[in-house]
């Protein structure tokens, strides 16, 4: 039954994160909750940074500033790989979560 | 030094494939982007195709899209574009260019080489 | 897309002149505007980037200016050697990566 309550959590998780992208940078809540996952976490997008390109909000070459290595204003405009983080949010919150919930 | 040299251009019938190739020295390929630009005689200079850091991220212009393919090979520190189903409006030069991004601009440039698409 | 217009399309200038060539965006790009000088027979150099920050190499007498859509490369004093075609380029939103139609300076 644990399991099933863990893969459940990942899967609503991922919806949720995938929904709240959709909304970014439009609605400021959601832009800031992301922000904060994204840096705390050293993460970037649901799977991963290329996530972004599908947003229609966002230019397919930026991410959010909160993906950044080093986060500074605008360093997620014209973003080189090598200065974000690449691996995804779900998979790496949802580690945390694996062990702590 | 840093050096980008392209080779592969000729000249090439209407409906045609060509590959072109870009050798990378002197930098740490796999940290740029990369870029192919043209320039057709007497004409600006023309945005083709470029490819991210690790080749997971292509874009192309709307006037080669699904004709030209941008790809690169870190190992062997290369960029290639393969051209098919060339028209005479695809006679350029060619550039390969490499890009750190951000705001730093496409900082080196190769010699060029020249397309020619002609019956 | 966003749009690059320069002006003058061609422009005649001595040796010695301040020369001022404009770059128009269609939208605002900040400072994601750099530019480039293209000598006949040979590949673009890259003069300027971010707007106003100097390429490692070019001399003291180019400068560029603006941020948003309007921008301006700036020759102090023209020298022989700088008589060539100038290209603005953006990279606030690419794809596709954009340029000026070019500007030529030719000899008075």
């Known amino acids: 039954a644990g399991y099933v309550f863990r893969d459940k959590v990942m899967s609503e998780f991922n919806n949720n994160f995938r929904q709240q992208m959709e909304n970014y940078p439009k609605n400021n809540h959601t832009a800031s909750i992301l922000d904060r996952m994204q840096a705390d976490f050293k993460c970037c997008g649901a799977a991963n940074y290329t996530d972004w390109e599908k947003i229609p909000s966002m230019s397919k070459n930026r991410v959010p500033d909160s993906c950044c290595i080093n986060v500074t204003v605008g360093c997620g405009i014209n973003f080189n790989e090598k200065a974000i983080h690449k691996e995804g949010c779900v998979e790496k919150i949802g580690g945390w979560l694996r062990k702590n919930v | 030094q840093v050096q980008l040299v392209e080779s592969g251009g000729g000249l090439v019938k209407p409906r045609g494939s060509l590959r072109l190739s870009c050798a990378a020295s002197?930098?740490?390929?796999?940290?740029?982007?990369m870029n192919w630009i043209r320039q057709a005689p007497g004409k600006g200079l023309e945005w083709v195709s470029y490819i991210s850091n690790s080749g997971n991220t292509k874009y192309y212009a709307d006037s080669v899209k699904g004709r030209f393919t941008i790809s690169r090979d870190n190992a062997y520190n290369s960029l290639y574009l393969q051209m098919n189903s060339l028209r005479a409006e695809d006679t350029a030069v060619y550039y390969c260019?490499?890009?750190?991004?951000?705001?730093?601009?496409?900082?080196?440039w190769g010699q060029g080489t020249t397309v020619t698409v002609s019956s | 897309d966003i749009q690059m217009t320069q002006s003058p399309s061609s422009l005649s200038a001595s040796v010695g002149d301040r020369v001022t060539i404009t770059c128009r965006a269609s939208q605002s790009i900040s400072s994601y505007l750099n530019w480039y000088q293209q000598k006949p027979g040979k590949a673009p150099k890259l003069l300027i980037y971010?707007?106003?920050s100097l390429q490692s190499g070019v001399p003291s007498r180019f400068s560029g200016s603006g941020s948003g859509t309007d921008f301006t490369l700036t020759i102090s004093s023209l020298q022989p050697e700088d008589f060539a075609t100038y290209y603005c380029q953006q990279s606030y939103s690419t794809p596709p990566i954009t340029f000026g139609q070019g500007t030529r300076l030719e000899i008075k």
């Open positions: 260019v490499r890009d750190p991004r951000s705001y730093y601009g496409m900082d080196v």
């Open positions: 002197g930098f740490i390929f796999d940290d740029y982007f």
């Open positions: 971010a707007a106003s």
